[in-house]
Interface confidence: medium
Amino acid sequence: VDSGNDVTDIADDGCPKPPEIAHGYVEHSVRYQCKNYYKLRTEGDGVYTLNDKKQWINKAVGDKLPECEADDGCPKPPEIAHGYVEHSVRYQCKNYYKLRTEGDGVYTLNNEKQWINKAVGDKLPECEAVCGKPKNPANPVQRILGGHLDAKGSFPWQAKMVSHHNLTTGATLINEQWLLTTAKNLFLNHSENATAKDIAPTLTLYVGKKQLVEIEKVVLHPNYSQVDIGLIKLKQKVSVNERVMPICLPSKDYAEVGRVGYVSGWGRNANFKFTDHLKYVMLPVADQDQCIRHYEGSTVPEKKTPKSPVGVQPILNEHTFCAGMSKYQEDTCYGDAGSAFAVHDLEEDTWYATGILSFDKSCAVAEYGVYVKVTSIQDWVQKTIAEN
């Protein structure tokens, strides 16, 4: 490049040359300083002067440069007689996250300047998402056909999935990167021989207040014709907050007859339009034999006959449970599948995904919605997440 100027070996740092003074000279010096939240570590004063050999020299430390170290604003603790100060730190997690460690989160500086925890050594803790603790839980006095608007964000685990043919279904966030849904939802508008790789790019997924998240892969349950379940892995972990939070997976089976669960959903309403607002309904777990008789005429295998009032037969087996309509004739409907049957454990003040809605065709016509028991699939879920 021809700039038309002589190029010298001195950088122009925009600093004007200081004026000369009689019987004096200009000595070049610099002062090192640190950015916000850092402080200078040096035995000198941070001022360096240019010597004859064009080296920057500090009076106290010579050419040894200072360092900037994090300033945690922590004053040095006072010394005590016959004692010493032991440096220790406690790791804590931000809101909506909790510490995962076998230790207590307290680390002490050893002689080799390593931070060590008594129980786990130098293995650091991790912050994992809190599950099942919505900031504004659903009001128990308060389709989904009918139901109540979730104005408060009481179901932060509820995701909305849209197929490439624009059909809305549900999915349930179970950790920062994984969601449960039904295999049928994943196969919507796909042929039976579609693979998980074919399906993933055709889905659009939203969490929280219509926050778009990208799907990395889907994994179908190995026995998905009988266990209507699939897992969705996101490309990135979601940030957990008031609007987005996973639901906990249960350590016990909450699907006891009469227990009330909450089902939220984006499914069809009384106009058979997909609802613009997340709705929820409270539904009781039903007697399984009554449910089987309702859909299949009998609990005796050889006497069974398809008799679904809505013309479509649900999958009913040892991996499923049924929930009845509410006393207000509220019910789940098309598009609510994949949503959780969420049970609030009052003692733990924690919400658990007891079931995943599989048969969402009841729409206040048939008496029961059908859910896959989460306890039946938990081992597979944990194994799949660990392997992926």
Partner: antibody, heavy 115, light 107 residues
């Protein structure tokens, strides 16, 4: 714009049967909920029955459940209401309407149940 | 079932008046509410849907508000042609129900 036209009303004796029809023209109603609403002389409006588009799920008011049957023929753009075991209190003008929020109404057809 | 109540049941107002009709649902219905006008001897006509959306072709003097269980229909500048009976109706879940109606006549 869709127009709805009801027909089939008339005078029937108690215990009798009748079928009302509603023809939609100007636009297809196959993708919409369809509904029957009635109004007894000098009285207010009462929802009777609704049918979803596809699959055709049916919903009834308690007062007609077990006696009335709603159906539709999407290929003909028709809605029907089969009324059995008619009672004096079923006397009313019957309207067919589109959707569950009734954005479009027909002119209605009068049913009188009397001996 | 969700019960709908309306008040007043009847009213008399002058041309140019601002008229307000209230509708209450016995329990939560979100914004799934419509208002209808029925003139004597005529078919009901929808004025408002989704609690506050104006049906196309309906004069802007009609407006709706509310959500949850309390709803209002307002006619800001009553005209002679506005006489008739006004009904609210929820479409939140089945069974669908109407309010008993408010009869408006012109003084």
């Amino acid at each position: 714009e869709v127009q709805l036209l009801e027909s089939g009303g008339g005078l029937v004796q108690p215990g009798g049967s009748l079928r009302l029809s509603c023809e939609a023209s100007g636009s297809s109603v196959s993708s919409h909920f369809m509904t029957w609403v009635r109004q007894s002389p000098g009285k207010g409006l009462e929802w009777v029955s609704s049918i979803s588009p596809n699959p055709a799920y049916t919903y009834y008011a308690n007062s007609v459940k077990g006696r009335f049957t709603i159906s539709r023929d999407n290929s003909k753009n028709m809605l029907y209401l089969q009324m059995n075991d008619l009672r004096a209190e079923d006397t009313a003008r019957y309207y067919c309407a589109r959707r569950s929020d009734f954005d479009t109404w027909g002119q209605g057809t009068m049913l009188t149940v009397s001996s | 079932d969700i019960q709908m109540t309306q008040s007043p049941s009847a009213m008399s107002a002058s041309v140019g008046d601002r008229v307000t009709i209230t509708c209450r649902a016995s329990r939560y219905i979100g914004k799934d509410l419509a208002w209808f006008q029925q003139k004597p001897g005529e078919v009901p006509k929808r004025l408002i849907y989704d609690a506050s959306s104006l049906q196309s072709g309906v004069p802007s003097r009609f407006s709706g508000s509310g959500s949850g269980t309390e709803f209002t229909l307002t006619v800001s500048n009553l005209q002679p042609e506005d006489l008739g009976t006004y009904y609210c109706q929820h479409y939140y879940t089945f069974p669908l129900t109407f309010g008993p109606g408010t009869k408006v006549d012109i003084k």
